[in-house]
């Protein structure tokens, strides 16, 4: 093995390099010194490094490592952040249009219901948006609330428009009757199934993307340990102490050091792989009733069908509701 | 069937986008994302190698630094000697991940569990969802024709499913991404604190 070239007799090269790292030359020895106080770049002979320089090298090494890590994840981070934003906005657009479709259906088919229907539809789709963004709302409750709110209006405006004002305190009964009489048939259940499935999947999809960002951010901003800092310093900077400015670390040595420094980070690998494969599986299943775009944009039609169902059974319903929502049966049996 | 509310979009931008020839649905966008993400599936296991390849490492030189001395690039000492009597690498590995990494691993485990439970079971015929989820016998009254059958997924083929192109604030064209593979920064553009 060839002997190392003799260190720069005046430490001049080392000084000029170090000046770029740390303006102010007072830390670099004029000439090589024994370096007995060094803890990382342990000298085999005279050295151009001081304890202060060593500390600066360690700091720089850890900083380099952090920057390398950030540049490594830049494209991945960009990909996920960008997509999370795109999908969130796209989902909001879908919700907005689904609301517009539904309002338009009411305006064109049931103009007498519109003022109140618009309000209930608006509240429903607001809840849909909040649910997608992670709000603690129950989808079945949202759908029930929509139909509970719509039915009294349908009953008083479409089925029984001549109802005297004195009878209008039956709204609460009508809300209850809506469920007990299964006024809308099985449409509410159908909508619950489709909306809850599609929204759950949409919500978990967004949650997963946001967690992806969190994972990258976490590993992006890792602070490396002192031990790692020492290993990196030895690999990248200790050669300078001997005046070996142009020498680069051995490849195998670099891999060993990096595996040591990144042992913790690499533990994420198994779960990261599983994350991507699980996300792929989820995405592959996001169609038909698991696709919120398909479900929400078709809601107006299902709601329309449900109102037609009520109208079809209006005669029988009106009779039953007349009994159930009477303040007392005894009025009828006197 | 319900009057289709095509002319009543409050957001006029949709009308502009709705008939674009090379339409892009949300589902195709999702699949595209997954394909891109899959190219990063080995991201974490490849990190050590990636960082070595993006920091100064002897490639064409005969001699390299092993942490203690100059050695020939292919000698055993190239990897081994530098570690001797210095730091116990095994100990460093044994310390286990930092608390923040452990936390993020726990979160990943949790989301993976959720993703698995939410995934549609393979082989499930979704076309039959009305039979599975829909009108139960007895719910439609005695007269069977009270049951409305036209409300399943079949009817949900909305004429123009939402397309989102120009109206999205973000454009995910590959050209916008800084590099289209995992090499985020070119090698000759090393981080400024390396002075080689």
């Amino acid at each position: 093995q060839p002997p190392p070239p003799p260190p720069d007799a005046t430490c001049h090269q080392v000084r000029s390099f170090f000046q770029r790292l740390q303006p102010g030359l007072k830390w670099v020895p004029e000439t090589p010194v024994p370096g007995s106080d060094l803890q990382v770049c342990l000298p085999k002979g005279p050295t151009c490094c001081s304890r202060k320089m060593e500390e600066k090298y360690q700091l720089t090494a850890r900083l380099n490592m952090e920057q390398l890590l950030q540049s490594a994840s830049m494209e991945l981070k960009f990909l996920i952040i960008q997509n999370a934003a795109v999908f969130q906005e796209a989902f909001e657009i879908v919700v907005r249009h689904a609301k517009n479709y539904t309002n338009a259906m009411f305006k064109n088919n049931y103009p007498s219901l519109t003022p109140q229907a618009f309000e209930f539809v608006g509240e429903f789709f607001t809840d849909v948006s909040l649910y997608i963004l992670g709000s603690d709302i129950n989808v079945d409750d949202m759908v029930n609330e929509l139909f509970d709110s719509l039915f009294p209006v349908i009953y008083t405006q479409l089925m029984n428009p001549g109802l005297p004002d004195s009878a209008l305190d039956i709204n609460e009964c009508l809300r209850g009757a809506r469920r007990d009489l299964k006024v809308f048939g099985n449409f509410p259940k159908l909508i619950m199934t489709q909306v809850s499935k599609s929204l759950q999947v949409t919500r978990i999809f967004l949650q997963a993307l946001n967690l992806g960002i969190e994972v990258i951010n976490t590993t992006d901003h890792l602070k490396f340990s002192k031990d790692c800092g020492r290993m990196l310093t030895r690999m990248w900077y200790c050669s300078y102490c001997q005046g070996l400015m142009m020498v680069k670390p051995c490849g195998g040595y670099c891999n060993v050091v990096m595996q040591g420094c990144m042992a913790g980070v690499v533990e994420i690998d198994k779960y990261w792989r599983e994350y991507i494969l699980s996300l792929e599986e989820l995405v592959n299943g996001m169609y038909r009733i698991y696709d919120m775009e398909n479900v929400l944009l078709g809601l107006f039609s299902t709601i329309h069908d449900s109102i037609q169902y009520v109208q079809k059974n209006a005669g029988k319903l009106t009779t039953t509701i007349g009994k159930l929502c009477a303040h007392s049966q005894q009025r009828q049996y006197r | 069937s319900a009057y289709y509310p095509e002319d009543l979009f409050i957001d006029k931008k949709v009308l502009k986008v709705a008939h674009v020839e090379h339409e892009e649905t949300l589902s195709s966008r999702r699949r595209e994302l997954i394909q891109k993400l899959k190219s990063f599936i080995s991201f974490y296991s490849a990190l050590p190698g990636y960082i070595c390849s993006h920091s100064p490492v002897a490639e064409n030189d005969t001699l390299c630094w092993n942490g203690q001395e100059l050695v020939e690039r292919y000698s055993q000492k190239a990897a081994r000697n530098g570690m001797k009597n210095q730091f116990n690498l095994h100990e460093l590995k044994m310390k286990g991940p930092e608390p923040v990494v452990s936390q993020i691993i726990d979160k990943l485990k949790h989301i993976n569990q959720l993703l698995r439970t939410m995934s549609v079971p393979k082989g499930r015929v979704l076309d039959k969802n009305l039979d599975e989820e829909g009108f139960e016998s007895g719910d439609c009254g005695d007269d069977e024709d009270e049951c409305i059958g036209g409300s399943g997924d079949g009817m949900m083929k909305v004429k123009n499913q939402l397309r989102f192109l120009a109206e999205l604030a973000y454009d995910l064209d590959v050209d916008d991404v800084p590099g289209n593979n995992q090499q985020a920064t070119p090698k000759d553009n090393e981080i400024s604190t390396f002075h080689n």
């Epitope: 305190d169 609460e172 009964c173 209850g176 009757a177 469920r179 007990d180 009489l181 299964k182 039953t320 009994k323 159930l324 929502c325 009477a326 303040h327 007392s328 049966q329 005894q330 049996y333 | -």
Partner: antibody
């Protein structure tokens, strides 16, 4: 005229179950709610649950969930309440009452349940 | 749950006397859902006054009911022997539906 006829008195062992019946006549059974109310000796009234026989929808007092199960048989215009895991606390008279959305108008004569070993 | 408190728990009145009993709810109850039942020993309760002020079928006109919000009352303008019984107020508004503890009316 509206009548609710309840099954006869029951003497049951602790831990056992009992199924009480309430047969309705004089009105359309599926059009009104059937409620069940408990009255312990010398005490007040306590609402247990109600069922809408037309759809089978049930509503329970949280206190009796898991204890009482309501069913209705349209063909015989009969409502049932199954009471399970009986203890001495369940010794009481149980009434069925038919109601609109607002009012319990008509009551059965009551069924006395005695839980004793 | 809505707690209904009846007072007095027991009262006695002479024949021909005016009688008033009250029912106080722990939170507001709509008058449409506040009712009174009469129960005599060994019998089932009978609907007596419904929706605060309406007399059930067969109830004598000497009975009346009033109130709103959290305060309701049942009044007998002139006590008669057949009126001796326990009277329960009841809210059928918010589940769990509840009854007051009862006012036992005796003849003095």
């Amino acid at each position: 005229q509206v009548q609710l006829k309840q099954s006869g008195a029951e003497l049951v062992r602790p831990g056992a179950s009992v199924k009480l019946s309430c047969k309705a006549s004089g009105y359309t059974f599926t059009d009104y709610y059937i409620n069940w109310v408990k009255q312990r000796p010398g005490q007040g009234l306590e609402w247990i649950a109600r069922i809408y026989p037309g759809s089978g929808n049930t509503y329970y007092n949280e206190k009796f969930k898991g204890k009482a199960t309501l069913t209705a048989e349209k063909s015989s215009s009969t409502a049932y309440m199954q009471f399970s895991s009986l203890t001495s606390e369940d010794s009481a008279v149980y009434f069925c009452a038919c109601s609109t959305y607002y009012t319990m108008d008509y009551w059965g004569q009551g069924t006395s349940v005695t839980v004793s070993s | 749950q809505i707690v209904l408190t009846q007072s007095p728990a027991i009262m006695s009145a002479s024949l021909g006397e005016r009688v008033t009993m009250t029912c106080t709810a722990s939170s507001g109850v709509s008058s449409s859902y506040l009712h009174w039942y009469q129960q005599k020993p060994g019998s089932s309760p009978k609907l007596w006054i419904y929706t605060t002020s309406n007399l059930a079928s067969g109830v004598p006109a000497r009975f009346s009911g009033s109130g709103s919000g959290t305060s309701y009352s049942l009044t007998i303008s002139s006590m008669e022997a057949e009126d001796a019984a326990t009277y329960y107020c009841h809210q059928y508004h918010r589940s769990p539906y509840t009854f007051g503890g009862g006012t036992k009316l005796e003849i003095k």
